[in-house]
């Protein structure tokens, strides 16, 4: 089953770890109040303490199943032979308002379980209606969801969920908005937020698209809410570059997708190509992203307020090999303000009757934009025309850091005392710690100041999550969760080494002659008691 916490990390003090030797790990979430860690895996859901001791394990598989059985065998007898089938956890979300965990798997056409947070007791497993089947695709890192709580004391919670469908467009929408009921056994659970004969809260990949491009699918890498919008970062087959000939080379494009939270008919659907470029090299394969707030310094440099959202992203080079992308990759920065502005400009242009809707995978014809006098502001959520809308120009991010050797796979970020720290997981199992400062001398917008091993030789998976107190970073590989301290100031034994490290967390604590955080140093606010700048070392 699951191993005990054990030592890790090279010359660092041992990191706390949780090992799961039998079952591959897929997803990780951290409870923002308790700090407890929930881990999704193949056939298991784990609950761990903040220091990674195992508190509970819940078995989700294997189950007797066959991917061809629709509906699943638990609902209707199936002519296909059943076999022991792994249940891969594909979505793991905390529903704070209902004190439950939503865990969606690959088995039984992609049904979800609701587990009580305290003890992982199964509260419900809706599985008898077609709306309960999200997708039978087994790939763990291809589905993303955002849970939207209902207005306090009233209103419905809902789940926005995106998933690949493996050609089964008659069974599964690629993107949908579902009702989340308080009672797990409620018949309306996972029902579409809106549905009539013509429109509903879902997008299906049209059968014509799949006829022409049988490999066409959309892979959902990251999703988040910002203001009144839900966004997805996706990878999809590029139908402009890929030949319909199945034997031809496949090219992929990264898209940012946006919907209004309160748009049950999906009239606000917009997608734009997204990527970044550095020294003539295009980085177009999105690997991970992380929504954050800029530190005071970065906000000032970007001309943003400190409470505005920014998006840190990792892109691999080029447009080929989605599953095994090139090692060369880039950490890039987008501001939501710029993304919103680009989208608004495109909508405004379309409502002036300029151009076409430009969404070939979704529309079976090149619909022209309709001229209309409507005022399009930042909050515009669409009409029943000029939708769905595709961007024709790539939204380009600011490249911060390029890794040519290891390959960046995951990203997280936070603001430490006004400075922006980014953590990037790599293909070799390392965590790179990066200080983002657009005013760096020499014009380098980011400085990689430390690299630590989480698990040697195993790629860091996407769910790189900070503990609620921002003291630790939880990094996950297929077999292990590692708790990495955000700083290891104590490893630096002199003032010069301490401040020469450029770790923004670290300063020289004069009273104890140790390198530490400011808040760990007695009388740090008194003059000459805490050195935060290399020049101060000489003075001390």
């Amino acid at each position: 089953e699951a191993g005990l916490p054990r030592a890790g990390g090279g010359s660092q003090p041992p990191f706390r770890t949780f090992s799961a030797s039998d079952w591959g790990l897929t997803h990780l979430v951290v409870h923002e109040q308790t700090g407890e860690v929930y881990v999704g895996a193949v056939n298991r859901i784990y609950k761990l303490s903040g220091n990674l001791t195992l508190l509970r394990a819940h078995v989700t598989g294997p189950v007797e199943d066959n991917e061809k059985c629709y509906p699943p065998p638990s609902v209707q007898s199936c002519p296909h032979g059943l076999g022991s089938t792994d249940n891969v956890n594909k979505l793991l979300l905390l529903d704070y308002a209902a004190n439950r965990l939503l865990a969606c798997g690959s088995a039984s056409q992609g049904i979800c379980q609701f587990l009580r947070l305290d003890d992982l007791f199964k509260l419900g497993e809706p599985h008898h209606r077609k709306e309960h089947y999200l997708s039978s695709v087994q790939e763990a890192g291809s589905m993303a969801g955002v849970l939207i709580a209902g207005p306090p004391g009233q209103g419905q919670a809902k789940l926005f969920v995106g998933t690949p469908i493996d050609g089964k467009s008659e069974y599964f929408p690629t993107l949908s908005s579902r009702r989340l009921m308080a009672n797990e056994e409620d018949a309306d659970m996972f029902g579409f937020v809106y549905q009539d004969e013509f429109v509903s809260s879902q997008l299906k990949i049209p059968s014509d698209t799949l006829s022409k491009f049988p490999a066409f699918d959309i892979y959902y890498v990251y999703s988040f809410r910002s203001e009144q919008f839900v966004y997805y970062l996706t990878l999809q087959l590029d139908t402009q570059l890929t030949s319909p000939d199945a034997a031809g080379e496949h090219f992929f494009t990264s898209k940012i997708v946006r919907l209004c939270v309160d748009d049950p008919k999906f009239y606000s659907y917009v997608e734009f190509p997204i990527g970044c470029e550095q020294a003539g090299v295009e980085y177009r394969l999105v690997q991970d992203a992380y929504l954050s707030r800029p530190g005071r310094a970065l906000a000032h440099q970007l001309g943003l307020a400190e409470d505005e959202d920014v998006l840190f992203t990792v892109f691999a080079q080029g447009q080929k090999n989605r599953v095994k992308p090139p090692k060369e990759s880039a950490l890039c920065l987008f501001t939501l303000r710029a993304i919103k502005e680009k989208i608004k400009e495109r909508i405004q242009s379309c409502y002036r009757g300029e151009g076409k809707l430009s969404l070939p995978w979704l529309l079976n014809k090149e619909l022209g934009c309709i001229n209309s006098p409507l005022q399009i502001d930042d909050d515009f959520c669409g009409q029943d025309f000029n939708q769905p809308l595709g961007g024709t120009v790539t939204i380009e991010g600011t490249p911060l850091f390029v890794d040519k050797d290891d390959g960046l796979t995951a990203v997280a970020a936070y603001d430490y005392r006004g400075r922006t720290v980014v953590f990037a997981g790599t293909r070799s199992g390392r965590i790179r710690k990066i200080l983002v400062d657009l005013s760096n001398p020499g014009g380098r917008p980011a400085l990689a100041y430390e690299s630590v091993v989480a698990q040697e030789g195993s790629p860091i998976l996407r769910d790189l999550v900070l503990s609620p107190n921002h003291q630790y970073l939880y990094a996950m590989t297929e077999k292990q969760v590692t708790r990495v301290p955000v700083e290891s100031c104590v490893q630096y034994t002199s003032c010069e080494l301490c401040l020469g490290s450029r770790d923004p967390h670290c300063g020289w604590c004069v009273l104890h002659s140790i390198c530490s955080r400011r808040d760990a140093c007695e009388r740090a606010d008194e003059p000459q008691r805490f050195a935060a700048d290399l020049l101060q070392c000489v003075q001390l």
């Epitope: 013509f198 429109v199 619909l367 309709i370 001229n371 009409q383």
Partner: antibody, heavy 119, light 108 residues
């Protein structure tokens, strides 16, 4: 059953105004728009405009801009169409229709209201 | 302003296939709808989004749209299909919905 029930026939003098009502039932009124279409005797259909019952946005046919006003009352699930400065060529059957969307057409129609403009 | 042109009348024998055309500039770049109107009655939507049938509309009604022409096809035409048929699309420059002039279908 989804229904649109329109007000009764009207006879008006040239230069006057007419206001036709359309009461919806059997569906969530604010989930759809209402289009207004007219048909002069022995003639074809002419689209007059559309109003969103969700947010009140309107789009009027260019030919009628300035003479037509469409409104809704969500509390009674009723749509209204007012046409001003009536002329004899405004004599027609006026239909309200549930607007399913630009791409989907008008899927439920009222029975029509005959408006006669005559001096 | 955008115009849709339909033949004033089409005749067909019972059981045969009737085709009613609707032409307009680059109509294939828009979605076309078709309405049936019997004498003294309100119009009924029979085809939307070029090819789709609303619930309750018989399978013998089908639609297509490409280039400059949309076509409503009624296979195995019945006497009850005798009616006026209107196509409808939109004017991209004004957002107006536009109807064709209508076609009277006579089942001989």
């Amino acid at each position: 059953e989804v229904q649109l029930v329109q007000s009764g026939a009207e006879v008006k003098k040239p230069g006057a105004s007419v206001k036709v009502s359309c009461k919806a039932s059997g569906y969530t009124f604010t989930s759809y728009g209402i289009s207004w279409v007219r048909q002069a005797p022995g003639q074809g259909l002419e689209w007059m405009g559309w109003i969103s019952a969700y947010n009140g946005n309107t789009n009027y046919a260019q030919k009628l801009q300035g003479r037509v006003t469409m409104t809704t009352d969500t509390s009674t699930s009723t749509a209204y169409m007012e046409l001003r400065s009536l002329r004899s060529d405004d004599t027609a059957v006026y239909y309200c229709a549930r607007h399913a969307g630009y791409y989907y057409g008008m899927d439920v129609w009222g029975k029509g209201t005959m408006v006669t403009v005559s001096s | 302003s955008y115009e849709l042109t339909q033949p004033p009348s089409v005749s067909v024998s019972p059981g045969q296939t009737a085709s009613i055309t609707c032409s307009g500039d680059k109509l294939g770049d828009k979605y076309a709808c078709w309405y049936q109107q019997k004498p003294g009655q309100s119009p009924v939507l029979v085809i939307y989004q070029d090819t789709k049938r609303p619930s309750g509309i018989p399978e013998r009604f089908s639609g297509s749209n490409s280039g400059n022409t949309a076509t409503l096809t009624i296979s195995g035409t019945q006497a009850m299909d005798e009616a006026d048929y209107y196509c409808q699309a939109w004017d991209s420059s004004t957002a107006d919905r536009v109807f064709g002039g209508g076609t009277k279908l006579t089942v001989l």
